[in-house]
């Protein structure tokens, strides 16, 4: 089996189920999908008026 547990069909889905490590649960499609890793927010430079935008690592294809 390549994938982790699945959710049920239908729009009234149960809570997210565990996925295999390279995946995460997409609430929109109620399914485990390939996921990249979020980077931690970059530290705000001293005196900056707004925080630097957050970014992410691309999913491995």
């Amino acid at each position: 089996m390549r994938r982790g547990p699945r959710s049920l069909r239908g729009r009234d889905a149960p809570a997210p189920t565990p996925c295999v490590p390279a995946e995460c649960f997409d609430l929109l499609v109620r399914h485990c999908v390939a996921c990249g890793l979020l980077r931690a927010p970059r530290p705000k430079p001293a005196g900056a008026s707004s925080p630097a935008p957050r970014t992410a690592l691309q999913p491995q294809e």
Partner: antibody
């Protein structure tokens, strides 16, 4: 390079059918969800349908339910939108898009990151 | 279905201006909001996902904030290439729904 290429649009009479294709390259569609989004001339974006190609789960906008069918062939890395009983209000540019996900505490944080160039569907007599 | 209401529907601004576009969801969508930029005749481009995360390759003058029902896209210093239409989209619950769009025009 990730790419999505739509084809199959054209002019069709009301009540007719069309099949749109979305050929993916640079990634495997079974790893993501694939969505169709349309845009009527001069209007905003409207989501149409999604599929998770790894298991064939689908969902549809109420406006197309029962008339449109989304499918995917993972061996061809291609998604499809079969459009039946077409109406004038279905006239739009149809885009396919990949939904990308990033892991936020086990849950997807994401959006539609790659889109095709769009294919125009015109329903008119 | 969740309605996404954008404001304003259009705005005129000059290069260098700070521009703010807001989006209100009809119910709580947590942080499951993305923002897209679209130019005439082109496909939309992802700018921001999960309300505040900048998508890869997007200039840092774009930023997003908000959670629950109220969300904001800010362009800190408008550039000539930023004149376009911007859409918010919620992806918390199917069907994913878009705002009606905000057209940013040259003053």
């Amino acid at each position: 390079e990730v790419q999505l290429v739509e084809s199959g649009g054209g002019l069709v009479q009301p009540g007719g059918s069309l099949r749109l294709s979305c050929a993916a390259s640079g990634f495997t569609i079974s790893s993501n969800s694939i969505h169709w989004v349309r845009q009527a001339p001069g209007k905003g974006l409207e989501w149409v349908a999604w599929i998770t190609p790894s298991d064939g789960n689908t969902d549809y906008a109420d406006s197309v339910k029962g008339r449109f069918t989304i499918s995917a062939d993972t061996s061809k890395n291609t998604a499809y939108l079969q459009m039946n009983s077409l109406r004038a209000e279905d006239t739009a540019v149809y885009y396919c898009a990949r939904r990308v996900c990033y892991n936020r505490l086990g849950v997807c944080a994401g959006g539609m990151d790659y889109w095709g160039q769009g294919t125009l569907v015109t329903v008119s007599s | 279905d969740i309605q996404m209401t954008q404001s304003p529907s259009s705005l005129s601004a000059s290069v260098g201006d700070r521009v703010t576009i807001t989006c209100r969801a009809s119910q709580d969508v947590s942080t499951a909001v993305a923002w897209y930029q679209q130019k005439p005749g082109k496909a939309p481009k992802l700018l921001i996902y999960s309300a505040s995360f900048l998508y890869s390759g997007v200039p840092s003058r774009f930023s997003g904030s908000g959670s629950g029902t109220d969300f904001t896209l800010t362009i800190s210093s408008l550039q000539p290439e930023d004149f376009a239409t911007y859409y918010c989209q919620q992806s918390r619950i199917t069907p994913p729904t878009f705002g009606q769009g905000t057209k940013v025009e040259i003053k």
